[in-house]
Interface confidence: medium
Amino acid sequence: FKVATPYSLYVCPEGQNVTLTCRLLGPVDKGHDVTFYKTWYRSSRGEVQTCSERRPIRNLTFQDLHLHHGGHQAANTSHDLAQRHGLESASDHHGNFSITMRNLTLLDSGLYCCLVVEIRHHHSEHRVHGAMELQVQTGKDAPSNCVVYPSSSQDSENITAA
């Protein structure tokens, strides 16, 4: 399977909310022995590999923001902790999963990564991730609402196997 990032760049005004999205593509094994762990974190564009370093989002680690379920099941974070930080991650039946960030500030600008780990118990773990940029702007040059820029077909699939 692969992870697609429909949008590679989100440009938002300060104070706005934004939902960053990733999509699971390809055959998804719905077997009893297969579960999916999905999460989000901030990173930097490393020289070797994007999304290698895992930094917190608003002081919440990737462990705090995880979703964990089988196949294309729906799930969302009910963590009070996440919601207190204006964050919520969610997943639907169609392979889409997202993180919503409320009341954006300039400090939220940066590179965001979604991570999916397919866990085949007794056998292996397979990792894929996607990357996207968030730019929060202020002042007269800022858009009135978030503007999203689609990924090129080449960029929209970020594949990292483990």
């Epitope: 022995d33 762990y37 462990q63 995880h66 963590h79 056998h123 292996s124 773990e125």
Partner: antibody
Framework: EVQLQQSGPELVKPGASMKISCKAS????????MNWVKQSHGKNLEWIGL????????SYNQKFKGKATLTVDKSSSTAYMELLSLTSEDSAVYYC???????????WGQGTSVTVSS | QIVLTQSPAIMSASPGEKVTMTCSAS?????MFWYQQKPGSSPRLLIY???NLASGVPLRFSGSGSGTSYSLTISRMEAEDAATYYC?????????FGSGTKLEIK
């Protein structure tokens, strides 16, 4: 603060069985796997297996199948490892450690020393 | 199973000296992880995903490598770095550790 508190040292007789506990606090227990590691003579580390508190799923190192049984009690956020039919080869320090999927064992218990002797 | 071979088994270094130890895998792995263990203590995560420092790890530590060959480097040895270092892989079951490199201070 993340903590993994293991039960105390054990002296057991050959052929007996015993259970080690690992109480987790300071994090979401179901968001991690609980892993168990054996360290013999203060040297090599061996991965015994893991259990997912999320769904009770287990994965074992084939070497420890039939020797170790992993369970969890979600209500008390405690992981257990039962060691069966003990021999002197099982004398070691056993660690529990939490691991997020796609990551590493970032917090470890203090270790439980098991001595098998008649 | 994937066998991880660490070398050297034992080494010593003077304060300020650069230290490099290696971990060789019997089959290709995607990422390597490194742990530090001092006598009487539990292992401590040092490096994840081959080259990223875990929280609180000093910047003098670094990791690199790919495929079957990985290394851990300490740019300037300090007395508190005396410990045993283990590499570990999560690429395939069973997850395995290296045999360890014991680093002593001169």
């Amino acid at each position: 603060e993340v903590q993994l508190q293991q039960s105390g040292p054990e002296l057991v007789k050959p052929g007996a069985s015993m259970k080690i506990s690992c109480k987790a606090s300071g994090f979401s227990f179901t968001g991690y796997t609980m892993n168990w590691v054996k360290q013999s003579h203060g040297k090599n580390l061996e991965w015994i297996g893991l259990i997912s508190p999320y769904n009770g799923g287990t994965s074992y190192n084939q070497k420890f199948k039939g020797k170790a049984t992993l369970t969890v009690d979600k209500s008390s956020s405690t992981a257990y490892m039962e060691l069966l039919s003990l021999t002197s080869e099982d004398s070691a320090v056993y660690y529990c450690a939490r691991r997020a999927y796609g990551y590493a064992m970032d917090y470890w218990g203090q270790g439980t020393s098991v001595t098998v002797s008649s | 199973q994937i066998v991880l071979t660490q070398s050297p088994a034992i080494m010593s270094a003077s304060p300020g000296e650069k230290v490099t130890m290696t971990c060789s895998a019997s089959s290709s792995v995607s990422y390597m992880f490194w742990y530090q263990q001092k006598p009487g203590s539990s292992p401590r995560l040092l490096i994840y995903d081959t080259s990223n420092l875990a929280s609180g790890v000093p910047l003098r530590f670094s990791g690199s490598g790919s495929g079957t060959s990985y290394s851990l480097t300490i740019s300037r040895m300090e007395a508190e770095d005396a410990a045993t270092y283990y590499c570990q892989q999560w690429s395939s079951y069973p997850f395995t550790f290296g045999s360890g490199t014991k680093l002593e201070i001169k």
